[in-house]
């Protein structure tokens, strides 16, 4: 049947609408024309569109589509950007507090080792930060560096305090002896295992969040093809050429067009789903030695235990080192005797239990739950965009790309479109190069996440040491234990809190001059309050 004639024989309505898109009326015919030069809005009769108008409609359609896509992903994008920033900052805070705890332990228990110990501790935790942020540092090297640096100071200040400055060349011999004689027992190896496992997981977690941002940014800024532009123009604007200003596209037709336009983007869906599920698995495994908060905040205790180990073996060590490094010393010095009790820090860090206090762990789980609500984001995009652009409800009295119809029929619409361009062909082109690249990156991160994810129910690694130290299982209750053995063990209720700034901040720069007691001890630290409230509206 022929289309109804334009209600406005003068194209007046079309002119006034088009003027909003493009000031000036030189492109709009005053009365309907044959439109033989049109390539998209192919007329079945007189038309109020010109070739130039059609080009402008195509440009506008593509811009509209880009804006719709950006608004579709806005909530998801904000969720990931916000959390990536919050977690990165939280991890930095954990590192800073871990450094402060360790410095405080030295200041309280081994004042003669400061300020050198502060310097080595500071360097170690700087390396930890760099590693988390993606620098290529070997964790074993970091830990070896810390103990290599500490031992000469421990030996010359604690075990052999009579050594004069002229014997400083013994330091190199002591560095070598540290490894050869395993003077710290298996503590360095224990720390290497715990630190490398927890930091690896932390680093991949941050990398995954940053890749999530990159994925959204990539699809957010996709430039749609000319074919897609034509389809969108036909759907949104060709009705205007017939003077049908108030007619909306059929919903089913919109879905067909969107699936054609977004065929490449929808290919991300499979890898996006896998990304969220793999990230969930990783997060579920981030506890005990796979939780950097747990490991780093307990390091001061393990380091303390390692120094005690050296002191317990001081007599034997001094004799051996005396022989081994004799050429480096001008004379033999008597090893100072220290009663063992002096060096055992009986204090245990107590963190008051506060109901509903947010932990890093709970924050991670909350993020995963929110992300899971976006698991179908890419497959649902065509439908989402149609539901957020004007479409006719129930597919009645709507525009099918060629004419006003009483009821939309997908088959009829497809047949009608065949001579104009092939929807199937559009789908077969494959994704844009940028989409292919992001799919490759998703595949890579998914592989990494799968590699890192732990088997369910796995606990702290056993058999860490050949010398009888077990990193140990802390039982099945809700307490988690950190650190090495004996008095150094810290118990923290319901995991360590999502950290806010502590009351004190003992940095390497100001620590030597700081006179106040700065060891984490009973009642000194009340509670670590909720960082999430400060940083995030995502509650």
């Amino acid at each position: 049947q022929p289309p109804p004639p334009p209600p406005d024989a003068t194209c007046h309505q079309v002119r006034s609408f088009f003027q909003r898109l493009q000031p000036g009326l030189k492109w709009v015919p005053e009365t309907p024309v044959p439109g033989s030069d049109l390539q998209v809005c192919l007329p079945k009769g007189p038309t109020c569109c010109s070739r130039k108008m059609e080009e402008k409609y195509q440009l506008t359609a593509r811009l509209n589509m880009e804006q719709l896509l950006q608004s579709a992903s806005m909530e998801l994008k904000f969720l990931i950007i916000q959390n990536a920033a919050v977690f990165q900052e939280a991890f930095e805070i954990v590192v800073r507090h871990a450094k402060n705890y360790t410095n405080a332990m030295f200041k309280n228990n081994y004042p003669s080792l400061t300020p050198q110990a502060f310097e080595f501790v500071g360097e170690f935790f700087t390396d930890v930060s760099l590693y988390i942020l993606g620098s290529d540092i070997n964790v074993d090297d970091m830990v070896n560096e810390l103990f290599d640096s500490l031992f000469p100071v421990i030996y010359t200040q604690l075990m052999n305090p009579g050594l004069p400055d002229s014997a400083l060349d013994i330091n190199e011999c002591l560095r070598g002896a540290r490894r050869d004689l395993k003077v710290f027992g298996n503590f360095p190896k224990l720390i290497m295992t715990q630190v490398s496992k927890s930091l690896q997981v932390t680093r991949i977690f941050l990398q995954a969040l940053n890749l999530g941002i990159e994925v959204i940014n990539t699809t957010d800024h996709l430039k749609f093809s000319k074919d897609c532009g034509r389809m969108l123009t036909r759907m949104w604007y060709c009705s205007y050429c017939q003077g049908l200003m108030m007619v909306k596209p059929c919903g089913g037709y919109c879905n067909v067009v969107m699936q054609g336009c977004m065929a490449g983007v929808v290919e991300i869906d499979k890898y996006w789903r896998e990304y969220i599920l793999s990230l969930e698995e990783l997060v579920n495994g981030m506890y005990r030695i796979y939780d950097m908060e747990n490991v780093l905040l307990g390091l001061f205790s393990t380091i303390h235990d390692s120094i005690q180990y050296v002191q317990k073996n001081a007599g034997k060590l001094t004799t051996t080192i005396g022989k081994l490094c004799a050429h480096s010393q001008q004379r033999q010095y008597r090893s100072a005797y220290y009663p063992e009790d002096l060096f055992i820090d009986k204090k245990v860090l107590k963190v008051a239990h506060v109901e509903h206090e947010e932990t890093l762990s709970s924050r991670r789980r909350e993020l995963i739950q929110k992300l899971k609500s976006f698991i179908s984001f890419y497959s649902a995009l065509p439908g989402y965009i149609c539901s957020h652009s004007p479409v006719a409800e129930n597919d009645t009295l709507c525009w099918n790309g060629q004419e006003l119809v009483e009821r939309y029929s997908q088959k009829a619409a497809r047949n009608g479109m065949k001579n104009q361009f092939n929807l199937h062909e559009l789908k077969m082109k494959g994704p844009e190069p940028v989409v292919s690249q992001i799919i490759d990156k998703l595949k890579h991160i998914n592989q990494l996440l799968r590699t890192m994810s732990m088997p369910k129910g796995r606990v702290l690694d056993k058999n860490l040491d050949e010398e009888g130290f077990e990193s140990g299982d802390c039982g099945d209750d809700e307490d988690e234990c950190i650190g090495g053995s004996g008095d150094g063990m810290i118990k923290v209720k319901n995991q360590l809190r999502f950290l806010a700034e502590l009351a004190y901040d003992l940095d390497v720069d100001d620590a030597p001059g700081n006179s106040q007691q700065a060891t984490p001890k009973d009642n000194e630290i009340s509670t670590f309050h909720n960082l999430g409230n400060v940083h995030s509206p995502l509650k």
């Epitope: 360097e123 700087t126 390396d127 930060s129 760099l130 942020l133 993606g134 620098s135 290529d136 540092i137 070997n138 074993d140 090297d141 970091m142 070896n144 560096e145 290599d148 190199e172 011999c173 560095r175 070598g176 490894r179």
Partner: antibody
Framework: QVQLQESGGGLVQPGRSLRLSCAAS????????MHWVRQAPGKGLEWVSA????????YYADSVKGRFTISRDNSKNTLYLQMNSLRAEDTAVYYC??????????????WGQGTLVTVSS | QSALTQPPSASGSPGQSVTISCTGT?????????VSWYQQYPGKAPKLLIY???LRPSGVPDRFSGSKSGTSASLAITGLQAEDGADYYC??????????FGGGTKVTVL
């Protein structure tokens, strides 16, 4: 006496390879990161490559990445630089340097005397 | 990686002071990465003068001092002596842990 002694330099044609060695003594070699730094005639210092104490991490300047390989043998207290696909612009005195630290670059507290590499046809 | 920026030359009479600047970016000097300074005589290997922005290795005279603020670092030589005539290089590293040197400053004692 802490010492570093480079060897292996000489005249080589463009496209060819050369291997530099650096023998270390007087310090615990396996505890420190090590570097190669070069200086073209009349020019400033240019960092070439670094390796961590265990050899677990290596780092390269963009200008040599893919062509040069740094390695170490802690049992022999020796640092190496394998230079492939040499170019005229690689002509320089190559210094071996010890880092203050073990895990990565910081400051170079001991330097060798350098070995001259000339790339010319 | 881009080099740090140093003035090509600086000069002063014996007893005077000379300050050499070294400007980097937010990804090297301006980050948490420390700056080191080296002295080099013609035909000789460089020698470490300052590390961690302001620390002097043993044997380096206290006439040499270092400082850092923001993306810039400085080396100050007070009470200039004839033997201070040499090339001076600053050095730092970036977040990829790749080392960056300054272009060098030639100090002339007049």
């Amino acid at each position: 006496q802490v010492q570093l002694q480079e060897s292996g330099g000489g005249l080589v044609q463009p496209g060819r390879s050369l291997r530099l060695s650096c023998a270390a003594s007087g310090f615990t070699f396996s505890s420190y990161a090590m570097h190669w730094v070069r200086q073209a005639p009349g020019k400033g210092l240019e960092w070439v490559s670094a390796i961590s104490s265990s050899g677990g991490s290596t780092y390269y300047a963009d200008s040599v990445k893919g062509r040069f390989t740094i390695s170490r043998d802690n049992s022999k207290n020796t640092l190496y630089l394998q230079m492939n696909s040499l170019r005229a612009e690689d002509t320089a005195v190559y210094y071996c340097a010890k880092d203050r630290r073990g895990s990565h670059a910081d400051a170079f507290d001991v330097w060798g005397q350098g070995t001259l590499v000339t790339v010319s046809s | 990686q881009s080099a740090l920026t140093q003035p090509p030359s600086a000069s002063g009479s014996p007893g005077q002071s000379v300050t050499i600047s070294c400007t980097g970016t937010s990804s090297d000097v301006g980050h948490k990465f420390p700056v080191s300074w080296y002295q080099q005589y013609p035909g000789k290997a460089p020698k470490l003068l300052i590390y961690k922005n302001l620390l002097r290795p043993s044997g380096v005279p206290d006439r040499f001092s270092g400082s850092k603020s923001g993306t810039s670092a400085s080396l100050a030589i007070t009470g200039l002596q004839a033997e201070d005539g040499a090339d001076y290089y600053c050095q730092s590293y970036d977040s990829s842990l790749r080392v960056v040197f300054g272009g060098g400053t030639k100090v002339t004692v007049l």
